[in-house]
């Protein structure tokens, strides 16, 4: 049997049953999430659930730039350090950079400091690039 790999929307990339869109647009976290949702297919800001997934994403992004942080779908909606993925994925894999989680920083970004392999918390109203994800 021939198994066809699902296709992603133009400009999105495929990895292990998911499509990812890296948007070089400056948006705050909530606007970024709304923009991801606007593409349909159940798209949200991306959850990153393994080192392999993180490495694939990081390699892709590094082909565009190496200095700008990027919003992902991890947030702390209750502002009580109870982090969760906006797409409902289980929060098991963690890759925090070890920076302070204090202050009014309740949204997560991929940090450029470690080639996008680690995360930092940041203020949700910051306007930055963002990564969307959906399952085709």
């Amino acid at each position: 049997d021939i198994i066809m790999r699902p296709s992603c929307a133009p400009g999105w990339f495929y990895h292990k049953s998911n499509c990812y869109g890296y948007f070089r647009k400056l948006r705050n976290w909530s606007d970024a999430e709304l923009e991801c949702q606007s593409y349909g297919n159940g798209a949200h800001l991306a959850s990153i659930l393994s080192l392999k997934e993180a490495s694939t994403i990081a390699e892709y992004i590094s082909g565009y730039q190496r200095s700008q942080p990027i919003w992902i779908g991890l947030h702390d909606p209750q502002k009580r350090q109870q982090w969760q993925w906006i797409d409902g994925a289980m929060y098991l894999y963690r890759s925090w950079s070890g920076k302070s989680m204090g202050g009014n920083k309740h949204c997560a970004e991929m940090s450029s400091n470690n080639n996008f392999l680690t995360w930092s918390s940041n203020e949700c109203n910051k306007r930055q690039h963002f990564l969307c994800k959906y399952r085709p």
Epitope: A9, G11, R24, K25
Partner: antibody, heavy 121, light 110 residues
């Protein structure tokens, strides 16, 4: 207040050379990428070239690659465009533009008044 | 021919709302921010809108930007005579690895 002042334009024959300068003030020049953008008479805008704040990275439109060279002297707060092998289609007003709010060098925050380059025999 | 497509002209009477479209593709507007520039007659261009809908200080809120998919638009509400100018959209193009402009739209106030 950001100020950009171009100079060096003029009339030149096809195949000739010209060097444009852009004197910058009102911001920390070395911190920001700079670009040259041109506009042929009665036409739209066309990006020509860009340079990083340090001067270590340069970028060119295909239409000028190999003929134009962008450079900067951060000690003099000045941007340059060396134009060689000029063609009639290079005739345009040349603007220098700064990015003073973003790390993307295609975001032209402030513009100079422009300098006219005419390539004609 | 420009990578981004704009209508060559648009017009309206004072007080009206005028919208200018800018059409691109997934290699430019689809994944990159859109900027709008205003060029008054005989003057250098001026940044009007950045990052889709942000206005630099000094730009009236009559000007607004929006974006959807691979298209963007600039709206001028409460049109005034001093808005008569050329308007250009711009973004980055991933395929060309270069900034690109639309061909420009001349707005006339009737």
């Amino acid at each position: 207040e950001v100020q950009l002042l171009e100079s060096g334009g003029g009339l030149v024959q096809p195949g000739g050379s010209l060097r444009l300068s852009c004197a910058a003030s009102g911001f920390t020049f070395s911190s920001y990428a700079m670009s040259w953008v041109r506009q042929a008479p009665g036409k739209g805008l066309e990006w020509v070239s860009a340079i990083s704040g340090s001067g270590g990275s340069t970028y060119y439109a295909d239409s000028v690659k190999g003929r134009f060279t962008i450079s900067r002297d951060n000690s003099k707060n000045t941007l340059y465009l060396q134009m060689n092998s000029l063609r009639a289609e290079d005739t345009a007003v040349y603007y220098c533009a700064s990015d003073s709010d973003s790390s993307d060098y295609y975001y032209f925050d402030s513009w100079g008044q422009g300098t006219m380059v005419t390539v004609s025999s | 021919q420009s990578v981004l497509t704009q209508p060559p002209s648009a017009s309206g009477t004072p007080g009206q709302r005028v919208t200018i479209s800018c059409s691109g593709s997934s290699s430019n507007i689809g994944f990159n921010d859109v900027y709008w520039y205003q060029q008054l007659p005989g003057l250098a261009p001026k940044l009007l809108i950045y990052s889709n809908n942000q206005r630099p200080s000094g730009v009236p809120d009559r000007f607004s930007g929006s974006e959807s998919g691979t298209s963007a638009s600039l709206a001028i509400s409460g049109l005034r005579s001093e808005d008569e100018a050329d308007y250009y959209c711009a973004t980055w193009d991933d395929s060309l690895s270069a900034p690109v402009f639309g061909g420009g739209t001349k707005v006339t106030v009737l």
